[in-house]
């Protein structure tokens, strides 16, 4: 059977039930390279607390649809002998990155993952050419992702002191200059991730190889290489290298640009200092808001939600969206979809698509940009679920008792976009990080 | 106050059944995962069996088809189901509570030997 997912399988991925203190590592091709789940071992569960390690999904027992991985095994999940198999379900949905697969429960027979992945989609138009795994739990499980960072299309620009040079990078995903050919990307190669510029001249200076590493708590590291053996002529004989090193910082902070801190014979070493490498934890909530020890902040935006049926109301040209934050309350336009945010066309106001729905909530504060994001809303031709992105600003004048209103911004592929200057953004520090 | 205390224990014949009893006081029983242990005279306290929060259960290999771990929210207790006793079965037996939000708590023991 061909594997399913082949984007997927050059590398043995992590998920996490912090719960009950129990790493899972997942090889959704082959078998995880574990001894004491066993050769076949295609989910292997290590629980940290008994120090034992449990093989819950056996590769030679695999059965896959489109959306759908299960590994079953010959381990009887309970006592009484029944036909009952531990197994474990992956269930796939469409993504802009090769994501993460996330652990969701287990009960007594069956451990459950989700998992948002280019790999899952029904059309190309997120695939790189090359990606690797964007995210590393530390000692204490507790997750770093730098998913956020990846562009999708152009680059982030490396602050150097050379003014002949321009070195561009992506996170974990080479640069697409096609879909934002800026004039400096055009002529970077397909598939690297380093592109130096030069002139009117650009090179390869580092593809992603392997995927993130933790090297302490606060210090994430990617590695880049160029593939080929070809020299570049100003390298002195060696193959260039890019590594860059992600700083979780010792408090909140706005977020910086990487900088160049070394270069020698094209072995490029970059810092960046963000809180995108700090544990999710410190950055985001499943709730409105974001306090306590943990998150050295105070951020609620529970006051926004909506009442008694009313929505915000924001005006995108060929459709309005509707939206209620922060609350369970049906838009009353969008049909019992669970929607936070609803898109309905103007010129026919029976199309209506959940753009986003309230259960499927996330809070995040990082690099000094509050956003709230609302995802899994109806399908798109891609197969990717209607997302909105709402950027919150601090604006203690805001209209409407201080609530501000949210403003349709634009659209990318479909992620919809919103600014809200409210009062309610305005953010209080604490500093015990 | 946090506690847990464990009964059942006991003398009983080789082959023979047990079933302990760990009953929870002072947390949100349902969040934690509960686990057992045993300590032989003279031995390193050794795992024995898991109930997680979320109901997954894993057992060591030597008692694998002999105990069953379960629980009771209602009544804030787990219990450990002990058939096919053998000897070597002879030990404390603690239960232990764990979750992200509390250290791990232990209870005090109950005794637990085969004999004929």
């Known amino acids: 059977q061909a594997a399913p997912f082949p984007e997927l399988c050059s590398y043995t991925w992590e998920a996490v039930d912090t719960k009950n203190n129990v790493l899972y590592k997942i090889n959704i091709c082959g078998s995880v390279d574990i001894v004491q789940c066993g050769p076949s071992s295609a989910v292997c569960m290590h629980d940290l607390k008994t120090r034992t390690y449990h093989s819950v999904g056996d590769s030679v027992l695999r059965s896959a649809t489109r959306s759908l991985l299960e590994f079953n095994t010959t381990v009887s999940c309970d006592q009484q002998g029944t036909n009952h198999r531990v197994q474990s379900s992956i269930a796939f949905l469409c993504g802009k990155t090769l994501g993460t697969p996330e652990f969701v429960t287990a009960t007594e027979c069956v451990h459950y993952f989700e998992w948002r992945t280019t790999a899952a989609c029904k059309k190309d138009i997120f695939k790189a050419n090359k990606e690797v795994p964007c995210y590393v739990f530390d000692e204490e499980l507790r997750k770093h992702d730098l998913n956020p960072l990846i562009k999708l299309s152009g680059a982030y620009l490396v602050d150097d002191s050379d003014p002949d040079t321009s070195l561009f990078i992506n996170v974990c995903r080479d640069i697409d200059t096609l879909r934002d050919p800026g004039s400096q990307l055009r002529a970077c190669p397909p598939g690297t991730a380093a592109c130096l510029v030069r002139g009117h001249q650009a090179f390869d200076v580092g593809q992603p190889r392997d995927g993130l590493k933790v090297v302490r708590k606060d210090r994430l590291v990617l590695s880049y290489v160029r593939e080929e053996a070809g020299k570049l002529d100003f390298c002195d004989g060696h193959s260039p290298a890019v590594t860059i090193t992600f700083v979780c910082p010792s408090e909140r902070r706005e977020g910086t640009i990487p900088k160049l801190t070394a270069k020698s014979n094209c072995r490029y070493e970059i810092e960046w200092i963000t809180e995108y490498a700090c544990h999710r934890d410190y950055l985001e909530s499943k709730t409105c808001s974001l306090s306590g020890e943990q998150q050295d902040v105070s951020i609620d935006l529970t006051p926004l939600a909506q009442s008694g049926g009313s929505s915000y109301i924001s005006d995108g040209k060929e459709y309005l969206f509707y939206l209620n934050v922060c609350g369970e309350t049906e838009i009353q336009f969008c049909n019992k979809k669970q929607a936070a945010v609803c898109q309905v066309k103007k010129s026919d106001t029976s199309q209506v698509k959940a753009a986003g729905r309230y259960h499927n909530q996330t809070l995040r504060y990082s690099d000094g940009f509050l956003t709230l994001i609302y995802f899994g809303g109806d399908e798109c031709s891609s197969g990717f679920q209607r997302m909105s992105v709402i950027n919150f600003e601090c604006n203690k004048t805001a209209g409407n008792d201080g609530k501000g209103t949210p403003v349709f911004t634009g659209e990318v592929d479909c992620t919809y976009f919103f600014t809200w200057d409210t009062e309610y953004a305005c953010v209080h520090h604490h500093h015990h990080h | 106050q946090v506690q847990l205390q464990e009964s059942g224990g006991g003398l009983v014949q080789p082959g023979g059944s047990l079933r302990l009893s760990c009953a929870a006081s002072?947390?949100?029983?349902?969040?934690?995962?509960m686990d057992w242990y045993r300590q032989a005279p003279g031995k390193q306290r050794e795992w024995v069996a898991t109930l997680a929060s979320y109901g997954w259960k894993t057992y060591a290999d030597s008692v694998k088809g002999r105990f069953t771990i379960s629980r009771d929210n209602t009544k804030n207790t787990v219990y450990l189901r002990m058939n096919s006793l053998k000897p070597e079965d002879t030990a404390v037996y603690y239960c232990?509570?764990?979750?992200?939000?509390?250290?791990?708590?232990w209870g005090q023991g109950t005794q637990v030997t085969v004999s004929s």
């Open positions: 232990k509570a764990s979750s992200p939000v509390l250290n791990d708590i």
């Open positions: 002072g947390i949100i029983f349902s969040d934690n995962r």
